[in-house]
């Protein structure tokens, strides 16, 4: 009894291909020994047709191969363009043909089904619609029209003009009889099922004068389109199911090991939690087509995906589908970047976003993923400078460090900033990436006054305290605008009293505005960076007001220098100003964000390339 196993019989039709898999015990010797496929002749000898050592016989040239899979103890013989001459007795085996381990296989190649003369062949994908045309003569115009399905030797009535409908076709079939003068009736079958395939017979009239026409309906499962994408990258499934289902709920599902299909996302609001933060179903066009984008691809995202339409938002037999086989390439061109960035309330994060380095001129964007319904990702900032109004003064997109990476800085963090954000460009869509911002317990590392009111014409000095761990970092002040943050001259003023534990290294860096002008009003950022890699930032809003006569209340220039934990405003300040302290963004009110250009002097940092050390800016 041979331990080699395979199919004892294989039956196919002319022109087809076969893929014969032979199993062997995967011992070390077996894995590496010769594998062969041979044909048994009348003499009992077995003539090799193809072997694992590269041999292919002349009558198999260009149409057969043998592939060994030693890790799972199988080898596969593929034979294409079968002819009836290929029928016969074969062996698949290991070692030498005449002795060794082998298994007998009988291959039978038949002519294929003989179709009656004049048969019209309809080839349609599952779930789609077919229209079968049935001609008839004038004398049969008033008579009964019918469509039958041939099953073996019998014919089963499918539909007729007397309103009969076979239950298997209920609600998805109709027979159309045209007006006078047109000698053809049609049968339309919607939402085709695999079980609908076969030979049909149209009939008009009865008796010897009846008209008959044969139709061969071939219903195909869609061949999956092979999709290869990079780990950490993005894939887009474009799904066009036809106008017939334009108003029906759509879905994308993934085929599981039980061969059922788990919904990944649908238009009814369902979404698989494994894709939280990294999937969008784009609204459908008038023709019913839609697309699904998945970012942050993981190895476990590999598999067979189906998109489809059904009122339940999930796979049902007989409804149109499209299929993809997704492969995720682990040797990715997309660099590793943190998928989670942590920040503290009141603090900041600096997010590194990869893009295709060949597309340095592309527009860069950052959007906030929203999970409601099909998901959406409204843009918050873009490299041309537009910033969503509620992010004024606390969000900036920088081209640095360049060469395939840009930076997004978000400060004045609150718990509402926690969530998923996408980095994208108007170029290569496969480089879309997702990052999750988490807000954790802790204090911001940089300390600045809560807000500052400067007096026109006077000098303003704004301190920024930083701890010793940033002593080797470059410190900067910049004036925020919706096109970026313009670096300003600042001075390092030596030790800070805000961090008592590391006095000699704990310092403050100050910004001086002298004299204060109207143009100085706005947001200022204090930050640290290493080369072109940005660390934490802290923001201050500077309001500018006229010099008041004695007795009126305003923030004195000196008060701006107060230590971070001191109140900047005195106790009698109006309620609205208290609110403004808690949320400096209220100072900005409902202004349209305009490009404030190169105010207060200084120049923007140049774009350079370097490599990232760390991401984000949480306090430890």
């Amino acid at each position: 009894k041979s331990p080699v196993f395979g199919p004892q019989e294989v039956s196919s039709v002319e022109g087809n291909s076969v893929s014969i898999k032979c199993y062997y015990p995967p011992t070390s010797v077996n894995r590496h020994t010769r594998k062969y496929w041979c044909r048994k002749g009348a003499s009992g000898r077995c003539i090799t047709l193809v072997s694992s050592e590269g041999y292919v016989s002349s009558n198999y040239a260009g149409r057969a191969n043998l592939t060994n899979f030693p890790e799972n103890g199988t080898f596969v013989v593929n034979i294409a363009q079968l002819s009836r001459d290929d029928s016969g007795h074969y062996k698949c085996g290991l070692g030498i043909n005449s002795r060794g381990l082998s298994f007998d296989v009988s291959l039978e190649v038949s002519q294929g089904p003989e179709l009656p003369n004049g048969t019209e062949v309809y080839t349609v994908d599952v779930g789609r619609t077919v229209t079968i045309k049935c001609p008839f003569k004038t004398e049969n115009a008033p008579k009964t029209k019918a469509l039958y399905k041939k099953i073996g030797q019998t014919s089963v009535l499918v539909i007729d003009s007397r309103n009969y409908v076979n239950p298997n076709y209920k609600d998805r079939i109709r027979l159309r009889i045209p007006g006078t003068g047109q000698l053809i009736f049609t049968v339309v079958i919607d939402r085709l099922r695999l079980s609908d395939h076969g030979l049909y017979l149209c009939q008009a009239g009865d008796g010897s004068n009846r008209d008959e026409k044969n139709a061969d309906l071939q219903v195909l499962e869609p061949e999956p389109e092979l999709v290869y994408e990079d780990l950490r990258g993005s894939v887009t499934f474009h799904c066009a199911l036809g106008l017939e289902v334009a108003n029906v709920a759509k879905f994308l599902c993934r085929v599981n090991s039980r061969e059922t299909c788990d919904v990944v996302i649908n238009t009814l609001g369902k979404r698989d939690s494994a894709f939280e933060g990294r999937i969008l179903l784009n609204p459908q066009d008038k023709d019913g087509s839609f697309s699904v984008v998945i970012t942050g691809l993981r190895k476990e995202d590999e598999g067979r995906y189906l998109c489809g339409a059904h009122s339940d938002g999930q796979l049902q037999e007989g409804w149109p589908i499209q299929a993809w086989q997704l492969f995720v390439n682990e040797e990715s061109t997309i660099p590793r970047s943190p998928t989670v960035v942590k920040g503290v309330a009141g603090g900041s994060v600096a997010v590194l976003c990869p893009y295709n380095p060949k597309e340095s001129q592309s527009l860069k964007y950052w959007c906030l993923w929203e999970g409601a319904q099909n998901g959406r990702c409204p843009l918050l900032v873009e490299s041309q400078g537009l910033v969503q109004e509620q992010y004024e003064g606390r969000l900036s997109l920088l081209q640095e460090p360049g060469n395939g990476t840009f930076t997004v800085i978000l400060n004045q963090l609150t718990t509402q900033d926690a969530g998923f954000y996408w980095c994208l460009t108007n170029g290569d869509t496969r480089w879309r990436t997702t990052v999750e911002i988490k807000i954790i317990e802790g204090e911001p590392n940089l300390k600045v006054p809560g807000n500052v009111t400067a007096v026109l014409g006077e000098t303003l000095n704004i301190p920024c305290h930083f701890p010793c761990k940033f002593s080797s970092y470059e410190k900067y002040w910049c004036k925020w605008s919706n096109t970026g943050c313009q670096t300003l001259p600042s001075q390092d003023e030596g030790p800070s009293e805000a961090f008592v534990n590391c006095d000699e290294n704990s310092r403050l860096v100050s910004l001086t505005l002298n004299p204060v002008t109207r143009a100085d009003e706005g947001w200022y950022w204090c930050g640290v960076k290493q080369g072109h890699f940005y660390g934490e930032t802290a923001a201050v809003y500077v309001a500018v007001e006229e010099k008041k006569v004695a007795g009126s209340r305003y923030v004195s220039p000196a008060k701006a220098d107060a230590a971070p934990d001191e109140k900047v405003l005195d106790s009698g300040v109006r309620e609205i100003e208290n609110k403004a302290i808690q949320d400096p963004r209220l100072f900005a009110e409902e202004k349209v964000v305009a490009d404030t250009g190169d105010q207060a002097g200084g120049s923007r940092a140049s774009v350079d390339s370097s490599s990232s050390e760390e991401q984000g800016g949480s306090s430890k």
Epitope: E9, V10, E259
Partner: nanobody, 128 residues
Framework: QVQLVESGGGSVQTGGSLRLSCTAS????????MGWFRQAPGKEREFVAG??????????YYADAVKGRFTIPRDNADNTIYLQMDSMKPDDTAVYYC???????????????????WGPGTQVTVSS
């Protein structure tokens, strides 16, 4: 979801014949694998015979113990496969199960774990 139902089981004398059928309802597939397994009292479930269909090609597999006696006939109708059992022996007494999976010729048909769907089984008894 796919449901499988076996029928045709019963009692037979040594040397006799039986024909089991397995009907699948629910989803149908153009590419699938179906198998017959059996489990005798106190023994493990074992592979008997199997069929894999990929387009217009069909592969037939048989266990050594039944080779030459059991066949899966070519007249399988849509969604139904048969197991023709001839020259039966007392050793063939068991509960016979039908199993199915979608997919092509890419798994070992002898392995029970390769199948997603199972029927409830039908008893076959061979007496001497």
């Amino acid at each position: 979801q796919v449901q499988l139902v076996e029928s045709g089981g019963g009692s037979v004398q040594t040397g006799g014949s039986l024909r089991l059928s397995c009907t699948a309802s629910g989803r149908t597939f153009s590419n699938y694998g179906m198998g017959w397994f059996r489990q005798a009292p106190g023994k493990e479930r074992e592979f008997v015979a199997g069929i894999t269909r990929s387009g217009r090609t069909t592969y037939y597999y048989y266990a050594d113990a039944v080779k030459g006696r059991f066949t899966i006939p070519r007249d399988n109708a849509d969604n139904t496969i048969y197991l023709q059992m001839d020259s039966m022996k007392p050793d063939d007494t068991a509960v016979y199960y039908c199993a199915a999976r979608q997919g092509e010729n890419n798994y070992d048909p002898r392995s029970g774990s390769a199948y997603n769907y199972w029927g409830p089984g039908t008893q076959v008894t061979v007496s001497s």
